[in-house]
């Protein structure tokens, strides 16, 4: 039974040209995390793997930095970066936990950070839902 919850930075906004930290935290489970994937809609942004460390997708290398921790820093934001981001925690023995963050990139200086929210264990994605994600990243 999956008992964990993922806390994320929730709905956030940032200014065009600025940077933002995407952060998730898995808690309330003693499952051990073996890999964390960061995805934007259907694109893989980055992987933090227990054995191999961080891997940033080539198309995002210039604008994505690993950390802090298991989080991800997006730099030189554009309006096209607006959208959903997912942190996907691969754990043993629980399986996969997924957290969602919505980022809105604004032209003006009205950007504000939204409140944190929690995604309960019910928001769960099986590895089979993502057949092409993260394959070949573990050794």
């Amino acid at each position: 039974m999956m008992t964990g919850t993922i806390e994320t930075t929730g709905n956030i906004s940032a200014e065009k040209g600025g940077s933002i930290i995407l952060q998730c935290h898995l808690s309330s489970t003693t499952a051990q995390v073996t890999q964390v994937n960061w995805e934007q809609q259907d694109q893989l942004l980055a992987i933090c793997n227990a054995d191999l460390g961080w891997h940033i997708s080539p198309s995002f290398k210039d604008r994505v930095a690993p950390g802090p921790g298991l989080g991800l820093t997006l730099q030189s934001l554009t309006v096209n970066d607006t959208g959903e981001y997912f942190c996907i925690y691969h754990t043993y023995p629980d399986g996969t936990y997924t957290g969602r963050i919505f980022l809105e990139v604004l032209e003006s200086s009205v950007a504000e950070h939204g409140a944190r929210f929690q995604i309960p264990t019910g928001d769960y994605k099986d590895d089979d839902d993502k057949p092409n994600k993260g394959s070949g990243t573990t050794s």
Epitope: E7, H25, L26, S27, T30, Q32, V33, T34, Q35, V36, C48, N49, A50, D51, G67, P68, G69, L70, H90, Y92, T138, S139
Partner: antibody, heavy 119, light 113 residues
Framework: EVQLVESGGGLVQPGGSLRLSCAAS????????MSWVRQAPGKGLEWVAY????????YYPDTVKGRFTISRDNAKNSLYLQMNSLRAEDTAVYYC????????????WGQGTTVTVSS | DIQMTQSPSSLSASVGDRVTITCKSS????????????LAWYQQKPGKAPKLLIY???TRESGVPSRFSGSGSGTDFTLTISSLQPEDFAVYYC?????????FGGGTKVEIK
Amino acid sequence: EVQLVESGGGLVQPGGSLRLSCAASGFAFSDYDMSWVRQAPGKGLEWVAYISDGGYNTYYPDTVKGRFTISRDNAKNSLYLQMNSLRAEDTAVYYCARQILLRYYFDYWGQGTTVTVSS
Amino acid sequence: DIQMTQSPSSLSASVGDRVTITCKSSQSLLYSSNQKNYLAWYQQKPGKAPKLLIYWASTRESGVPSRFSGSGSGTDFTLTISSLQPEDFAVYYCQQYHSYPWTFGGGTKVEIK
């Protein structure tokens, strides 16, 4: 150079409390998970507490659960272990140890601080 | 809890000897998802903190001499010192980091014959 320096050990009576500290330097403390591991006199090693990089997760073995609390202050590069309701069997050298994210072995250890629980 | 059993508990050896220490776990330490064995080996000298030697069962930590090697998978693991040096006389511990609570073997003391 990575350095972990424990302090706060000493003699305490059964049922008493003690707070251990670990000062970290030479690395980005907030990017690492941390644990406390103890070693009773002449005995082996026993892991007693874990805290994640941001302090969101803490785990304990049953032997100390409910009595020990691990915490950290990333702004001060410091790790703590609050020990309550101490027992004679808690007598040990207590080490703080660093863990790389997603790896759960201990890659650096402090020199240890001695806790003696005795009346 | 996963029990870790080391053998022998102590051994006497001479400089230049090949030394083998075994560690058995009560359940498999192999993760199928990444094919990694979650086992580490440490060396501890009297009055000193433990020092990491090997992780993932067979990966040598940076700076550890090549005479130290780890092997094994699943539940059976071995630490080998190919040619014992004077500075290698110490206590050696295995540790599983596969599941909470993380547990250590009882230790193997390597003494001078």
